[in-house]
Interface confidence: medium
Amino acid sequence: EVEKTACPSGKKAREIDESLIFYKKWELEACVDAALLATQMDRVNAIPFTYEQLDVLKHKLDELYPQGYPESVIQHLGYLFLKMSPEDIRKWNVTSLETLKALLEVNKGHEMSPQVATLIDRFVKGRGQLDKDTLDTLTAFYPGYLCSLSPEELSSVPPSSIWAVRPQDLDTCDPRQLDVLYPKARLAFQNMNGSEYFVKIQSFLGGAPTEDLKALSQQNVSMDLATFMKLRTDAVLPLTVAEVQKLLGPHVEGLKAEERHRPVRDWILRQRQDDLDTLGLGLQGGIPNGYLVLDLSMQEALS
């Protein structure tokens, strides 16, 4: 709390300018009118106030707007945004994408702070859904943003927004998140031709079911091993050796290097050794010749 003291003669601020940067804490409190500050917030960012001075300016705004700052002030907070607590931000009603961009710019280059997370949450909730422009903005500043959302939150992403997603935005997504995103991506890219479709859908395939992988295997897509290794194990297991060979194309040789890792290891255990041998890669661990395979899960489903 800053002590209330009278402003010294001749020091009353008529505008927010550089002359204030050497004001003591108490002088700023006494000589800067909060309403003036609010109307000239855009100038604050251009003036290298010290952290101590920013504390005083924030205190003045807090007194002027106890219920939360108006968007006209929020948009011009600049570095003062870094002084805000999540509690402060929860009082705000941010509706403009320009305001969001301005505040994200201040935090650029840093990890997502609790303040930024709260700001984004308030913004998205206010909009009701994660539209394309918002997603575009958020992933530009935080490539990992999508993967920080729960599957429930991701369900509010409209398929049209998927166009804004870049492969690196999905790097840290887990299978549960890709399960939600994949159907949206499939819908978003459905009108594209084969090779273009595969380029776009590739990074979402960690959520693809078996039937879609089977369909892709008929399209000469030449899936790379890195993508194959991210596929759901339960989606890969039912694929035949021929289907995997078609799916991977020339990359099929990479299976040997990955034979001890999932999903390749589990897939090998489900294939007949005869079929694996046709690949000529020396893959071992398949079902020996003459053995009968009972699919107990299918039997249970029928009974």
Partner: antibody, heavy 121, light 107 residues
């Protein structure tokens, strides 16, 4: 190449005046706050004075307040420190430094090599 | 004015050693602390600003940490060119103040 070059130092008697200068080059001088920092023989660095980009606002350490005046001429890319009523305790290497603004306040990212001021009778 | 106390005032170390220098502020200064290196007869050089941000061109063996009142400068593996005096400076409020310096000497 960003450069700051101080000049004007020398030996001066107590009570007399001296003006030191700092010529800046390689950057937009008018876009930066500037500082004078000094270092007495065998001692640490001591903040002396600062001036805003347009010269409209200045600040001084208590030890020099009322005796030293900082100023700048943006058309000449030059910073000045007018020192009067000099004392033996003002003997030091005087460095000119550029203030790099950040939201956590100023730090000095470019320094000159310094000019030596010796106050002695 | 905010006082900054550095410790130790001097230390002896060998090439390859990990060196830690501390700076304590007389009141909380958030992350408004900067570190400088100075060699005899030379101008100070900015190493770290805002407590932990490495100035462009400074080797990554230098790192800074801390916030509030306690700060640390660490040199992960001391090199021959690192023997110098290191000073901290606060930019939380004016007047700006410096610590007394820590001289790093060859053992």
């Amino acid at each position: 190449q960003v450069h700051l070059v101080e000049s004007g130092g020398g030996v001066v008697q107590p009570g007399r005046s001296l003006r030191v200068s700092c010529a800046a080059s390689g950057f937009t001088f008018s876009g930066y706050a500037m500082y004078w920092v000094r270092q007495a023989p065998g001692k640490g660095l001591e903040y002396v004075s600062a001036i805003t980009t347009n010269g409209g606002s200045t600040n001084y350490a208590d030890s020099v307040k009322g005796r030293f005046t900082i100023s700048r001429d943006n058309s000449k890319n030059t910073l000045y420190l007018q020192m009067s009523s000099l004392r033996a305790g003002d003997t030091a290497v005087y460095y000119c430094a550029r203030g790099a603004p950040g939201y956590r306040g100023y730090y000095m990212d470019v320094w000159g090599k310094g000019t030596t001021v010796t106050v002695s009778s | 004015d905010i006082q900054l106390t550095q410790s130790p005032s001097s230390l002896s170390a060998s090439v390859g050693d990990r060196v830690t220098i501390t700076c304590r502020a007389s009141q909380s200064i958030s992350s408004s602390l900067n570190w400088y290196q100075q060699k005899p007869g030379k101008a100070p050089k900015l190493l770290i600003y805002a407590a932990s941000s490495l100035q462009s061109g400074v080797p990554s063996r230098f790192s800074g940490s801390g916030s509030g009142t306690d700060f640390t400068l660490t040199i992960s593996s001391l090199q021959p060119e690192d023997f110098a005096t290191y000073s901290c400076q606060q930019s939380y409020s004016t007047p700006l103040t410096f610590g007394g310096g820590t001289k790093v000497e060859i053992k």
